[in-house]
Interface confidence: low
């Protein structure tokens, strides 16, 4: 077990904090949680602090909760692999650009680490040449989430990992906006990470409301399990 | 809950659990099960507000959730059973998304439980 892993063993508190800027709309918003990276579980309430949210809130899930990836499970035969919480507590810094299909593309920046016993996810997000009456900034895409597989590879270089995967956002027509991440997650401190194998992480979210919030916000619940790495010759055989 | 009986190692039993429009809407229905002398352990649940489901490692790629939401109704198709599979199996209804995957302590509702008892 990492040092960082032990720090996963049960229900940790989770703040999120994100200043955006898209095509000039600035907004803020706040989210909070937990997570238990024994269920690979997450569940978070994230509230736009500035008013009405200018995009559409799917289009930040990867931003918010693909941002923690330190609590997605393991299983057991993969936990060597575990760059996210072997970074822990110090932390990443995870940078995306987010491409969205024939329209603008997010820039974001974050910095991911334990403050106390929290974990936080400060992040800075860009948005530009997303059109106005686009599916974005149009609010043409329906609010719920699929399925997706999240790609991880070491960069040895940079002591982190490079993430791609595309997200399937559904839209209001029946058609799909396509949205393509490349990421990078890089150690904050010194000591050692793990640098894992290729492999991917397979998520689940669902988006809800709270009846009793006024405010624009949206309500998360996502399980995150990483796969894709088989036991090794010598665990078939004990 | 229904479903339950005796079966041969390798076979296939489908539960079935109705609970009540208010407390199946937007919140979760798990399966748990209990054999003599153990805990009662989550084996699968779904959370019914996003069709998002968590399975234990041990019944991973053999057991199944599903919903049917016009009828209030969670199933669990459980294939390929083993011997230690058998067990009490119950039905219970937790309290939104956060119940789903987080052990019996978060569920509010439960069945009476019906019997699966896999023999070799």
């Known amino acids: 077990m990492s040092k960082g892993e032990e720090l996963f063993t049960g229900v940790v508190p989770i703040l999120v904090e994100l200043d955006g800027d898209v095509n000039g709309h600035k907004f803020s918003v706040s989210g909070e949680g937990e997570g238990d990276a024994t269920y690979g579980k997450l569940t978070l309430k994230f509230i736009c602090t500035t008013g009405k949210l200018p995009v559409p809130w799917p289009t930040l899930v990867t931003t918010f909760s693909y941002g923690v990836q330190c609590f997605s499970r393991y299983p057991d035969h993969m936990k060597q692999h575990d760059f996210f919480k072997s970074a822990m507590p110090e932390g990443y810094v995870q940078e995306r650009t987010i491409f969205f299909k024939d329209d603008g593309n997010y820039k974001t920046r974050a910095e991911v680490k334990f403050e106390g016993d929290t974990l936080v996810n400060r992040i800075e997000l860009k948005g530009i040449d997303f059109k106005e009456d686009g599916n974005i900034l149009g609010h043409k895409l329906e609010y719920n989430y699929n399925s997706h597989n999240v790609y991880i590879m070491a960069d040895k270089q940079k002591n982190g990992i490079k993430v791609n995967f595309k997200i399937r956002h559904n839209i209001e027509d029946g058609s799909v906006q396509l949205a393509d991440h490349y990421q990078q997650n890089t150690p904050i401190g010194d000591g050692p990470v793990l640098l894992p194998d290729n492999h991917y992480l397979s998520t689940q979210s669902a988006l809800s409301k709270d009846p009793n919030e006024k405010r624009d916000h949206m309500v998360l619940l996502e399980f995150v399990t990483a796969a894709g790495i088989t036991h090794g010759m010598d665990e078939l055989y004990k | 809950e229904s479903g339950g009986g005796s079966v041969q190692a390798g076979g296939s039993l489908r539960l079935s659990c109705a609970a009540p429009?208010?407390?199946?809407?937007?919140?979760?229905m798990g399966w748990f099960r209990q054999a003599p002398g153990k805990e009662r352990e989550e084996v699968a649940s779904i959370y019914t507000g996003g069709d998002i489901t968590y399975y234990a490692d041990s019944v991973k790629g053999r057991f199944t959730m599903s919903q049917d939401n016009a009828r209030s109704t969670v199933y669990l198709q459980m294939n390929s059973l083993k011997p230690e599979d058998t067990a009490m199996y119950y039905c219970?209804?937790?309290?939104?998304?956060?119940?789903?995957?987080?052990?019996?302590?978060?569920?509010?509702?439960w069945g009476q439980g019906t019997q699966v008892t896999v023999s070799s």
């Open positions: 219970a209804a937790g309290r939104g998304s956060w119940s789903c995957g987080s052990g019996p302590d978060e569920y509010k509702y």
């Open positions: 429009r208010s407390t199946y809407t937007s919140n979760c």
